[in-house]
């Protein structure tokens, strides 16, 4: 039930990568807009995107706040012209999302190999730090800041010359692996939150290769 | 829950090839890292190699390199392990187990491979 | 590629003794290093990951310690269902490597 020609929304999907966070739903509006609130479970609604077009709305800003608190959001629908009008219980049309808990279930992004230096037969490979949106004392956290230990790096590196593969792990944003003198290595790194159940692990990271700009070779 | 199911016991010739599999239930194989362990009768344990299902990079100890094959099929969430010209030494029990990123936190039962002519 | 080195090979114990495994790895594994039981004809089983946390259903009675090169297994108080062999996995970088074991057997 609900005001004539405005129907719920449905499909409420929380898309999310290093704490960037929007809501989508469906559908696209016809003679409707939609205001979107969300709160923490103990928390007041908090209204955003008000009377919007659109199927989506950005919640970073609020889930940034606190990113271990679990969140829910609900969806308001009201007929274009007049949003004053509620349904036929007294109130607004809304669907209600999944619920969200950033820490746990934001993915993770696509990392990226900042440098790597040779030094005789050790290589070491850094993992660029990426920022995030979430602030600690007016500043931006990376997302080692975020997760700490939780968050390791897989290393897959292999001789350009050949196939066989070998793999590292790092807790920080470093690896220092052994290779052969005078051959030239690929790398790739995917980020991993092993003590999660989902969104467990990242894309790989684009492949990198010595002899390329971003290393730096000394004896 | 998690489970990891192994293909049953094989009797092979030397010099020949056999392939084992492993198939996975109760988590998304995409989301872990699968390894193969091999244990001789009354022995250790030994890392024969490992794959990422999600992107198809596949690791070996050199010691196996060139005789085995890991492999994952993610539509049916079955890791398979494929070794070649096999020897006497061979014939042992084989493990395959779900890497987490901090450890191997479920092993299958054990697949009794015998080389024996 | 890294050695694991675990020691003793093997060990007799009594019900209710406090029991120490270690295992040296040859370059620092930054804490990749989880520990295994196994009896026999059984698949092994996970105790400790990531050098110090207990896995799910282990009894707190095992602990994990150590960083860097060195690790130690400890069983607070054993108990008769822990007569097995125990084995440490350095999972830092490939090739994996396994201690020997560390049979622990009824005195």
């Known amino acids: 039930s609900g005001t004539t020609n405005t129907v719920a929304a449905y499909n409420l999907t929380w898309k999310s990568t290093n704490f960037k966070t929007i809501l989508e739903w469906e559908p696209k509006p016809v003679n409707q807009v939609y205001t979107v609130q969300i709160s923490t479970k103990s928390g007041d609604w908090k209204s955003k995107c008000f009377y919007t077009t659109d199927t989506e709305c950005d919640l970073t800003d609020e889930i940034v706040k606190d990113v271990k608190q679990t969140y829910l959001a609900r969806v308001f629908s009201y007929p274009a012209g007049n949003v004053e009008s509620t349904g036929s219980a007294g109130e607004p049309l809304y669907e209600n999302s999944p619920e969200f808990t950033p820490y746990l279930e934001t993915n993770l992004g696509q990392p990226t190999i900042q440098s790597f230096e040779q030094v005789g037969t050790k290589v070491n490979v850094t993992v660029e730090d990426e920022r995030t949106l979430v602030r600690r004392n007016n500043t931006f956290l990376s997302l080692r800041d975020v997760f700490g230990k939780d968050l390791i790096y897989t290393l897959y590196y292999w001789k350009s010359s050949s196939s066989g593969k070998k793999t590292a792990k790092t807790n920080t944003n470093e690896f220092l692996i052994d290779v052969d003198k005078g051959e030239n290595y690929c790398f790739s790194v995917q980020a991993v939150i092993p003590s999660r159940t989902v969104n467990r692990k990242s894309t790989d990271s684009p492949v990198e290769c010595m002899g390329q700009e971003k290393g730096e070779f000394r004896e | 829950q998690v489970q990891l199911l192994e293909s049953g016991a094989v009797l092979a010739r030397p010099g020949t090839s056999v392939k084992i599999s492993c198939k996975a239930s109760g988590f998304n194989i995409k989301d872990y890292y699968m390894h193969w362990v091999k244990q001789r009768p009354g022995q250790g344990l030994e890392w024969i190699g490992g794959?990422?299902?999600?992107?198809?990079?596949?690791m070996y100890d050199p010691k196996f390199q060139g005789r085995v094959t890991i492999t994952a099929d993610t539509s049916t969430s079955t890791v398979f392990m494929e070794l070649s010209s096999l020897r006497s030494e061979d014939t042992a029990v084989y493990y395959c187990?779900?890497?987490?990123?901090?450890?191997?936190?479920?092993w299958g039962q054990g697949t009794l491979v015998t080389v024996s002519s | 590629d890294i050695q694991m080195t675990q020691s003793p090979s093997s060990l007799s114990a009594s019900v209710g003794d406090r029991v120490t495994i270690t295992c040296k790895a040859s370059q620092d594994i930054k804490s990749f290093l989880s520990w295994y039981q196994q009896k026999p004809e059984k698949a092994p089983k996970s105790l400790i990951y990531?050098?110090?946390s207990l896995a799910d259903g282990v009894p707190s009675r095992f602990s994990g310690s150590g960083s860097g090169t060195d690790y130690t297994l400890t069983i607070s108080s054993l108990q008769p269902e822990d007569f097995a062999t125990y084995y440490c996995?350095?999972?830092?970088?490939?090739?994996?490597?396994f201690g020997g074991g560390t049979k622990v057997e009824i005195k």
């Open positions: 794959n990422d299902p999600a992107n198809k990079h596949s």
């Open positions: 996995l350095q999972h830092g970088e490939s090739p994996y490597t």
């Open positions: 187990a779900r890497d987490s990123g901090y450890a191997m936190d479920y």
């Open positions: 990531y050098a110090t």
